[in-house]
Every structure is written in C-alpha cells, then in structure tokens.
C-alpha cells in the first residue's frame, strides 16, 4: 500500500503508532497520532490505505513524531499506519509500516443487542444470563433495569459482548443495556431495545421502551472497577444532566417520558 521501496523487516523495523486521547472519539476532539521509531529517524510519514504518498510528514531528528488532527470529523476516521526514514537510506525507502491503528470518529456507537440466555422465560430457582452485544472489543457494558436509576451491573469486556447474570428470584423485569469506551473522553452507544424477562407461565410480553418510564439516562458507571469514575466535566454538553452520576451526553440518553409528559 505504501511504497514499492519498503525493504525487508530486518533492515528497518516497524514503528509503533498510537492515538491520544483515544482511538474512538466524538467529532470535534483533537487527536494526536504518535509514531515512535525504534531508532532516531529523520522523517516520519503518516499513511492511509490505498494512498502511496504520505497523508502527513513530520521532519524530526528523534524517535517520536506527533501528527495533530484538529477537531476531527467522521471522515478522518479509518485506518492509519506510519513509517520512518533516515537520510542515509535510498530515495523513497521507508521503514516497515507500523501495525494499523483504526481511528473511529462517531457521535454514538451502534446499538447493541440484548438477549437472554437460555431464554427470556425464567423457571423457579433458575438463573438467567443477559448478553449485551456490540461490535467493538474492549468496551465497558452497562445493564439497566426499569425503575432502577443506577446501573444494575457493569462489565468491562475484551470481547464485543458482555454477559450479566441475574438470579432467578429477582430476574423478572424489563432491561436495557449500552456500552461505552472504557476511559475519557467517553463515547457512548445507542441504547439497546428493551428485553422483558418473565416468570415461566407468564410468557414474555413485547413492550415498547416508551412504556418504560423508569429507565434512566445511562452514563458510564459511577464506580467501574479498573476505570476511573468519569466526572460530569469530562462530557461534552450535549444535554441536561438528569442524575448526578448519570451524565446525559448523547442523542439517545433521555429516559422515555411518562405518558403524561409529551417530552423531556
């Protein structure tokens, strides 16, 4: 993709490419892509697939080059690689390319699915597992129950899904989930469709979420083990804050209004 003049790996080992503050961000965030070479270099290039010429150059006599992407737009998302070169190398010769870095610029991550395993009908004494499944790995997943303001459970998962276990006696109810990036600046997903868990013999009812006024506005968990609890100031002012620990940042994070209220 980059150039026909890339030599064998043993000659010029690949650099490392990382993103600050994160690889998943909302539009308007300033992103810095850092390319670190294993040896001092003279020129660094940032490449996107299918383009022979570098997208950006940095001429620095060091092991680190920073590429600044100001107030990113969704179009600036995609796959990036970087290479480096030294003046004593032949013309057009670059190092091996770094591993790919995928930058994702989105307002809200895609809606997860929420399913019950083995099913939405719970027998006496049986537990049920709820699987909240998104499309991205290394996300934090949050489970909500109708009528309960705080998150019921949360999990960080290396997989694109997380499983939440509900004890049989307490399982019946209406649930919803979402996921978010594990650290600030947080990017939240759309909320899942609701899932109704019922007792055996009752049968699950299909209920629109708009009839579930107790679902509160989700936000990253207030005390996620292994992640610093986000403060309100770490969120963009995309809406009002309904709960002190549940910042409202996204298009979908209002609770459905009660029937008597035409809107929030």
């Amino acid at each position: 993709d980059i150039t026909p003049s890339v030599p064998p790996a043993s000659y010029h080992p690949k650099p490392w490419l990382g993103a600050q503050p994160a690889t998943v961000v909302t539009p308007g965030v300033n992103v810095t892509l850092r390319c670190r070479a294993p040896q001092p270099a003279w020129r660094f290039g940032l490449f996107k697939p299918g383009e022979i010429a570098p997208l950006l150059f940095r001429d620095v006599s060091s092991e680190l080059a920073e590429f600044f992407l100001e107030e990113v737009t969704p179009a600036q998302g995609g796959i990036y690689r970087c290479c480096y070169r030294r003046p004593d190398w032949g013309p057009g010769v670059w190092s091996q390319p770094s591993d790919v870095l995928e930058l994702l610029v989105t307002e809200e991550l895609p809606r997860p699915s929420l399913v019950a395993l083995p099913g939405p009908v719970v027998g006496p004494g049986a537990n049920v597992s709820l699987r909240c499944a998104g499309r991205l790995r290394n996300m934090s997943f949050v489970l909500y129950r109708e009528g309960v303001a705080a998150p019921l459970q949360y999990r960080h998962s290396a997989q694109p899904w997380a499983d939440f276990t509900l004890l049989g006696a307490r399982a019946p109810g209406t649930y919803s989930c979402y996921y978010h990036t594990p650290s600030a600046p947080y990017v939240l997903s759309q909320r899942s469709e609701v899932l109704v868990i019922s007792w055996e013999g009752e049968g699950p009812e299909a209920r629109p979420a708009s009839s579930a006024p107790g679902m509160q506005a989700p936000g990253p968990p207030p005390s996620d083990p292994g992640a610093q609890a986000p403060s309100l100031s770490s969120f963009r002012p995309r809406g009002l804050v309904l709960q002190p620990l549940l910042p409202q940042t996204q298009d979908s994070w209002d609770p459905a209004p009660p029937p008597s209220d035409p809107g929030v």
Partner: antibody, heavy 123, light 107 residues
Framework: EVQLQQSGAELVKPGASVKLSCTAS????????VHWVKQRPDQGLEWIGR????????KYDPKFRGKATITADSSSNTAYLQLSSLTSEDTAVYYC????????????????WGQGTSVTVSS | DIVLTQSPATLSVTPGDSVSLSCRAS??????LHWYQQKSHESPRLLIK???QSISGIPSRFRGSGSGTDFTLSINSVETEDFGVYFC?????????FGGGTKLEIK
C-alpha cells in the same frame, strides 16, 4: 435507494389535530433517529424534535412541547408527527429527516429528508 | 438556546463568481455545524457536515471551514443550479437550531 416518503397535504380546521407520517425505505429506521423540522411559508427551518424509533425515546424543542408528539412504528418503518390544537401559526411544511449513520455508529447531520407535508390551518 | 446568525440575508451574484456565506454561533460549538441547501419547492439537502467534511455526491466547489463560533461556506465559481437558500444547523446542544438562511440569487 434510501427514501423518506411523507404523507400528503392536509387542510385542517383551527383547534383540530393532524397526524403526519414518514415512511422509510432502503434502510431500517431502528438504526438511526428521525427528526422533524417545520418551515413556515417563505421562512427558515425550525427543529421540532426527534425520536429514537427502536426504543420510542423522544426529545423536543421546548417551544413545541404540548403542540407536537413524535412516535414511531418500527414494524412499518414509519415515524409520525402529531400536531394538536392547530392554529394559523401551524400552517407550514413539515419535513422528516434521518441522522446519518454507518457501520460504526451515528453522526448528527441529517443526510436524507422527506419531500415535506404541507399543513394548512384554515376555517 | 444557541442562536445561529447567517449573513448576508441575501447575496446577489453572477454565475462564475465565487462567494462566501457566514454562520456565527452565539457560543462555541467546536465543529458541530452542518450546512444545507434548499432550492425553491424542494427539501433541504446536506452539503457539508462537521464544518468542513464534504458529502459524497456534492460538487467539490462547495467547501466548509471554521470552528468555534465562526463558520464559512464557500462556493467556488457559482453555477446556475446553486441558487437557493443555504442554512446552517448546530448539533452541539439541545435544542438543535438552524440559522435564518442566506438566499443566493442571480444578479
């Protein structure tokens, strides 16, 4: 092909209500959000509100509260705008529009618009 | 509410001219600003999103720039099909708001 097909023109009497529809084709409305926008004759655009059709969640401009109610039926891939207690001030063209989205989520620009529904309030 | 002020209200130009339309926000909205074109008796059409991102199918003569509170839509060498009204819209805070529009008309 992505399309938003809106219901036909309405002539209604003051004090009455009207329900406008916006039927999507070429995409599933549950994947995005549907917004409604008002445009009075020879005037600018006014944002009314939006719905997340998958969960029925709505957001309104406060000045349209009590006037507009947005709903959706994902089984028919249709969003609705109901306007109540109509007055001459509600005479306008009403547009539905969807938010742009892709495999990796939403952005907040409105990339496809319906053709508009003209509502005339007159006795 | 964030107020978007567009200027001028009307711009009279000759085809082939290059023009700049302004949209000013009452407070900073970073790059959460989108531009729409509306021709007579038609629906609005998205031209530029996030202040500067071009849209597939929109001619390259349309270019957006700006950040914070001041934004510009530039049209390089206006064509007859470009006449109409141009609106800016912010998606930074609730409620969403539109500018009052700039009418681009033939001189």
């Amino acid at each position: 092909e992505v399309q938003l097909q809106q219901s036909g023109a309405e002539l209604v009497k003051p004090g009455a209500s009207v329900k406008l529809s916006c039927t999507a084709s070429g995409f599933n409305i549950k994947d995005t959000y549907v917004h409604w926008v008002k445009q009075r004759p020879d005037q600018g655009l006014e944002w009314i509100g939006r719905i997340d059709p998958a969960i029925g969640n709505t957001k309104y401009d406060p000045k349209f509260r009590g006037k507009a109610t947005i709903t959706a039926d994902s089984s028919s891939n249709t969003a609705y705008l109901q306007l109540s207690s109509l007055t001459s001030e509600d005479t306008a063209v009403y547009y539905c529009a969807r938010l742009s989205y892709g495999n990796y989520g939403l952005d907040y620009s409105m990339d496809y618009w319906g053709q508009g529904t003209s509502v005339t309030v007159s006795s | 509410d964030i107020v978007l002020t567009q200027s001028p209200a009307t711009l009279s130009v000759t085809p082939g001219d290059s023009v700049s339309l302004s949209c000013r926000a009452s407070q900073s909205i970073t790059n959460n600003l989108h531009w729409y074109q509306q021709k007579s008796h038609e629906s609005p059409r998205l031209l530029i999103k996030y202040a500067s991102q071009s849209i597939s199918g929109i001619p390259s003569r349309f270019r957006g720039s700006g950040s914070g509170t001041d934004f510009t839509l530039s049209i390089n060498s206006v064509e007859t099909e470009d006449f109409g009204v141009y609106f800016c819209q912010q998606s930074n805070t609730w409620p969403r708001t539109f500018g009052g529009g700039t009418k681009l008309e033939i001189k």
